[in-house]
Every structure is written in C-alpha cells, then in structure tokens.
Interface confidence: low
C-alpha cells in the first residue's frame, strides 16, 4: 500500500504579554516531534486586547474579566478543541506592573490574582501570571530574535531564511522599547561585565553565551514622555509648557495630579500654584532633543564605561535588532530602511517634528490623534536614547535593524519566555536524526 | 519687536476703583503670561498677579486678591488691571510685564502708569 | 509667598566691585535650574532684566553684571563699577510666581 503521511502532529503554546499601555496575546505552534530543534516554533497570532494596561485596572479589577475575553475566545477558534488542554498559557506583566508594584504589592497582587482567575477559566493549561523582571525581559527579548534568526543552530545553512542574516553565527544584539521600559542586551566582545546584575550566562545547544543586559525602568517611551513633562514644567512655573517635542500649534491640556501619578516622576515633583496646564507645542527637533538628554545623567559612572544613570555598559559590539516601539515608531516614520543613515534619520526628524500640527492631522488622517501626536518626540527619544544613551554613533548606526517580525513571528520578548518555561531551548546540541520532516508508515 | 503701552495717568478718590490697560504690539499675549507690579514711591517692587490670556486664569498675590481683577482680551491684545476700594496706599506707578517659560529670556515691561488717590 | 531678603544699600567706588546679596526664605532650586532673576531700576524708568536663572546674562547687558548662587543665597556682582550703575537692583524669583527682593540702592561714590 502506499505511505500516508500521519495526521499533523503540533503543539500549541499562549503567551499574554501584559505591557505598561496594551496587552498582547501571541499563539505559537510547532511541529511535537521537533521541539528541541532551533526556529521551528512560529506565530500563528496575535490579538492585541482592547484598552489599557492591565496595571490600569487597579481600581476596576472587577472588569479584568470582560478585557481578556475577546482575545482568550479568539485562542479557543484558533487552536484545534482536541489541543485545549494541553495548550500552556502563561502571561508576563512587565514595567507597567513593576511600577504599580513600587507604589503599592498589595494591588499588583491584587491585579495579577484576579488575572489568574479570569485565564483559569479557559480550557487551557493556564500556568500562572507573574511579573519578570527587566532582566528576564531583555534576556527573553535576546533568545527569542536570535532563535528567530537561526543563531543557535550550529547547521551552516547554503540559504539564507532572514533578510538580516549574515553567515555567521554571532549574535545579534536586542533593543527593545516599551512604554515604561527599555532593555539592552547584546555578548560583549571579550569584556568583563563589571557589574554582577548585568551578566547573564546561557548555555544553548551546546554553546555557552555571556551576555550583558540592562532593563531601564522609566525609560520606555510614555514614561520617558511623562518624566521630560514633570522636568519642564518645573521650569515653567506657569500653566504653559511651550514643548519642542510636540507640532507647532498643537495644544493639550494636562492635569498635575496624572503627571505625578507615576513613581518615574517622582524625582521631579514639586508643589505647583496650578491643577492643570497647557502643552503648547513649538516643533523643534533640536530643542527636544536637548530637553530629553536631560533625562539622562551622565555625569556620574563608577564602572569603566556606562550608559546613563550610573549603569555599566560594555562598547557596543556587532548587529543590533530594534523592535516593539523602536520597530512600530520608526515604521511610521518610514526610517526603518537600512539606507537610511542616522544623519538622514536626524534631518527627517527636524522636518517632521517642524511641520504644522492641522498639516500632520490632515496627511495622517487615519491615525488617532494621542498616538499622532507623540511620534515626534517619541522619534527624537529614540535618537537620543540610541545615539547619547547606549552610544551608537554615525557609523555603528548601520549596525542598527529596525525589526517588526522575523519570519512571520513578532520580535519580543514572548517567544523567548515561552521557549525557556516549555524547556525548547536544550542546553547541549541535539543529536542530529536521520528522520526526514514527514515520518511515513 | 515686543512693545507694551500703558494708558495714562489717573487720579481717584478713595474708594473709587481705577482701571488700567497694557496694549502688546509685535506678538500675541497669548504667548505670554501677563503679570502686574505696583511700586509706590521711593518704595520696592511688589508683584499683584498675572494672567495666562489663553484660558484667562488669573493668579493673584494675597496681598491683592480681594481688590484687583486682571482680565485680557485677546482681540486687541490688551491686557487689563483693575484695583477697587482705592485707599491713598494705592498710589504708585503699575507695570505690566511679560513671561514666558522662565529660562527663555523674553522679558519685557510697559512703562508704567502713575496712579494717584487723594480726596 | 517665597520672602527675599536683600542688603538695603551699597556706596561703591568707580571701578570697584560691588556686591549685593538676596537671601530667599525657601529654596528656588528645583533639580539643577534655579528661579533667580536680577533687575536693574532707573528712576523714573520701569526695571530692566539683568541676570535669569541665577547666573544667565540677558542680552544686552554688559559683561561686568554677573551672578551666582543656588539654593537660599544668591549675589548680583558688578566689576568694575561705573558711574552709570547707580539705581536700584531688585532680586526676584519665579520659581512660584513672582516675588521681589526689597532692594538694593546702590550709590557710586
């Protein structure tokens, strides 16, 4: 008789990302018997959860339910019913969380507990809900684009499967921005990591990998936005803040009480003689730029080299991939080309930062106006975080890619938290088998 | 260039009230907060308040907040400061002045107007 | 309402240095930008800025004006005196509203 192939044998696993301003539900699926072989774990979807972070709900945790649903129903149509039950579903809440955390345990835990009980009620393999740490964040971030890129397979490949890809097997660097937190992880070239919390060590498919992470808490886009408002304000000592981060003739009116909501501008809180004020922007990418270097202090490193406030960073070393926001935000910008250089990137910024308000609404009509309004300084903050914060220059900036997705599945930090708590990433090579991709009988 | 022209010279009799207006020629005083100082003579400088024209929200100083009413009227890019129950205190020279963020230097001053109260 | 201190009055010879203080009543710092401005007062002419945020000169205004200071004390020095220094100097802070200095008189001998 003739060989039929077997039915389709994959396995499915959810991860929730629970950023700082959205969350995100990602499905991943690979074949059962090639768990432990490098880049055959894929996306097959996403949902992005309508609404706010989840740290959002922390005085309306009764709602959490009705927010996940829509997501949670999509999973359930996606993944075959025969799979439910053992489809893992962890979620990960990340900056957003951990600064609710710095204000109050009692009500992360509180969020995070009725988490866990709307997602048990799913018929999937829920595994908890937890907070990682920014070291986990960038870590995960690191495994899962060089997974992606086929980094860790030690087959030399006569193809190449990713645009990014270049022949051999060293790693790519990760940036990832967020809303509340930016991580950096990246193998520095022989250099000792000279601060202990920075150095992680792996040991993957056989090769050991020292790598340097830092998490910077505050310095996601939204938060950074948050504290250079909290820093100018003070300046101002008015009700106006003329803000060369915004278009000319834009204007918005913020309360004091949302400004200093957030543990990011504690530092900067001062008694203002007013409950609101008015943002009026004046479109100067310069002037931006120099209000959002004063973010960083520079002026105190007690290592051999740091990045910012004090934090150890090793000499910038190889490709870089930049995704999540650094992706989505330069994606709109339309500066993700490899062509573009960071001179151009900066000369585009100037034009675009400069250009009427009324004329961006009218050319991007489609786009809500909250996220329109902050590309600008959202633009010139990753230029400035690139370039002053972690030391880019001109020239390394070609070592930069810009990354929404590598082969079909989002550069992130899910893929990778995933890989690690299903143990798909082995410590020591696999030993190769003679099995074609279809087992016949 | 940024001018400010004040009307000119009052006399009042206690209790009466005195109005006096700031006229913004070269920007908008919008752009600006509008503050008042009163100076009696041979006396120091004594802030009264300030308006943000844009959302006309005033500010006084405690010294002043029941008697004087500071509005703007942005048609004319004049800027207004009213100062009711006139006792012979109140005699002085009144100046408006401009702010903009502190740490951008654009300051300018009107030229003041004498304000006498005698019966 | 922030209370600024100033010395009352200074007789100076030309050029000598003169030196006038203002003490605030709370700090007009706030992370690194500090709310102190200087004026100069003609008679019969409204004030003129000298000095903002404590040490920036306006423009205009001669190098000889200069001044310092940071928290709760702060100094307008002016080196070398001239003749045409006499007038009042006002200290004044913006760092919650305004409010002025007594003043200082200054007299060139």
């Known amino acids: 008789t003739q060989n039929k192939a077997l039915p389709e044998n994959v396995k499915y696993g959810i991860v929730l990302d629970a950023g700082s301003s959205h969350t995100s539900l990602y499905i991943y699926k690979w074949p059962a018997e090639k768990e432990n072989d490098t880049g055959v774990v894929h996306q097959v979807e996403e949902c992005r959860v309508k609404g706010p972070g989840i740290s959002k709900f922390v005085q309306k945790v009764n709602e959490i339910g009705i927010y996940l649903t829509d997501c949670m129903e999509r999973a359930r149509e996606v993944i075959p019913r025969s799979q439910h039950q053992e489809t893992p579903v962890y979620l990960g809440a990340t900056a957003g969380m951990r600064l609710l955390r710095m204000e109050s345990e009692e009500l992360a835990d509180r969020v995070l507990d009725v988490v866990e009980r709307s997602l048990s009620n799913y018929p999937f393999d829920f595994q908890g809900a937890r907070i990682i740490t920014g070291q986990e964040e960038g870590a995960y971030g690191w495994i899962t684009i060089n997974y992606l890129l086929g980094k860790f397979s030690q087959k030399t490949r006569w193809f190449s499967i990713v645009p990014y890809e270049t022949n051999n097997q060293e790693t790519f660097g990760a940036l990832d921005l967020g809303g509340a937190s930016t991580q950096v992880t990246f193998v520095p070239q022989n250099q000792t990591i000279e601060s202990p919390d920075n150095a992680l060590q792996f040991r993957l498919y056989g090769k050991d990998y020292n790598v340097y992470t830092h998490s910077f808490l505050c310095y996601g886009k939204d938060q950074a936005l948050w504290q250079k408002l909290a820093k100018d304000i003070q300046v101002a000592s008015n009700e106006i803040l003329r803000d060369p981060c915004f278009h000319p003739g834009y204007k918005k009116v913020v309360n004091v009480s949302d400004l200093y909501k957030t543990p990011c501008t504690k530092r900067f809180e001062m008694t203002l003689p007013f409950q609101q004020f008015e943002i009026q922007g004046i479109g100067n990418y310069q002037q931006c730029h120099q209000s959002i270097l004063e973010l960083f202090n520079t002026s105190y490193c007690p290592y051999s080299q740091c990045a910012f406030n004090g934090i150890f960073l090793p000499p910038l070393q190889g490709d870089f991939g930049a995704f999540s926001a650094f992706y989505f935000v330069m994606k709109f910008l339309n500066l993700t080309s490899e062509k573009v250089s960071q001179e151009k990137v900066t000369e585009m910024m100037k034009k675009f930062c400069a250009q009427p308000w009324e004329e961006i609404k009218t050319s991007y009509a489609g786009v809500k106006e909250k996220y329109l309004s902050e590309y600008c300084f959202s633009g010139t903050y990753i230029l400035s975080l690139l370039l002053q914060g972690y030391h880019f220059t001109a020239d390394s900036w070609e070592h930069i890619h810009f990354i929404g997705k590598i082969q079909g599945s989002d550069a992130g930090w899910t893929l990778g938290y995933m890989l690690n708590l299903t143990n798909m990433i082995p410590a020591e090579q696999p030993l190769s088998t003679p099995l074609s991709h279809s087992t016949y009988v | 260039e940024v001018q400010l022209v004040q009307s000119g010279a009052e006399v009042k009799k206690p209790g009466a009230t005195v109005k006096i207006s700031c006229k913004v020629s070269?920007?908008?005083?919008?752009?600006?907060?509008m503050h008042w100082v009163q100076q009696a003579p041979g006396k120091g400088l004594e802030w009264m308040g300030r308006?943000?024209?844009?959302?006309?929200?005033?500010k006084y100083a405690e010294k002043f907040k029941n008697r004087v009413t500071i509005t703007a009227d942005t048609s004319t890019n004049t800027v207004y400061m009213e100062l009711s129950s006139l006792r012979s205190e109140d005699t002085a020279v009144y100046y408006c002045?401009?702010?903009?963020?502190?740490?951008?230097?654009?300051?300018?001053w009107g030229q003041g107007v004498m304000v006498t109260v005698s019966s | 309402d922030i209370v600024l201190t100033q010395s009352p009055a200074l007789a100076v010879s030309p050029g000598q240095r003169a030196t006038i203080t203002c003490r605030t009543q709370?700090?007009?710092?706030?992370?690194?930008?500090?709310?102190m401005n200087w004026y100069q007062q003609k008679p019969g002419q409204p004030p003129k800025l000298l000095i903002y945020?404590?040490?920036s000169l306006a423009s205009g205004v001669p190098a000889r004006f200069s001044g310092s200071g940071s928290g709760t004390d702060f100094t307008l020095t002016i080196n070398p005196v001239e003749a045409d220094d006499t007038a009042n100097y006002y200290c004044?802070?913006?760092?919650?509203?305004?409010?002025f200095g007594g003043g200082t008189k200054v007299e060139i001998k």
């Open positions: 002045a401009t702010e903009r963020v502190p740490g951008f230097e654009t300051d300018y």
């Open positions: 070269g920007d908008s005083i919008t752009a600006y907060f």
């Open positions: 308006i943000d024209p844009d959302h006309e929200r005033t």
């Open positions: 709370q700090t007009v710092d706030h992370y690194g930008t500090t709310y």
């Open positions: 945020l404590a040490s």
């Open positions: 004044q802070q913006s760092r919650n509203l305004w409010t």
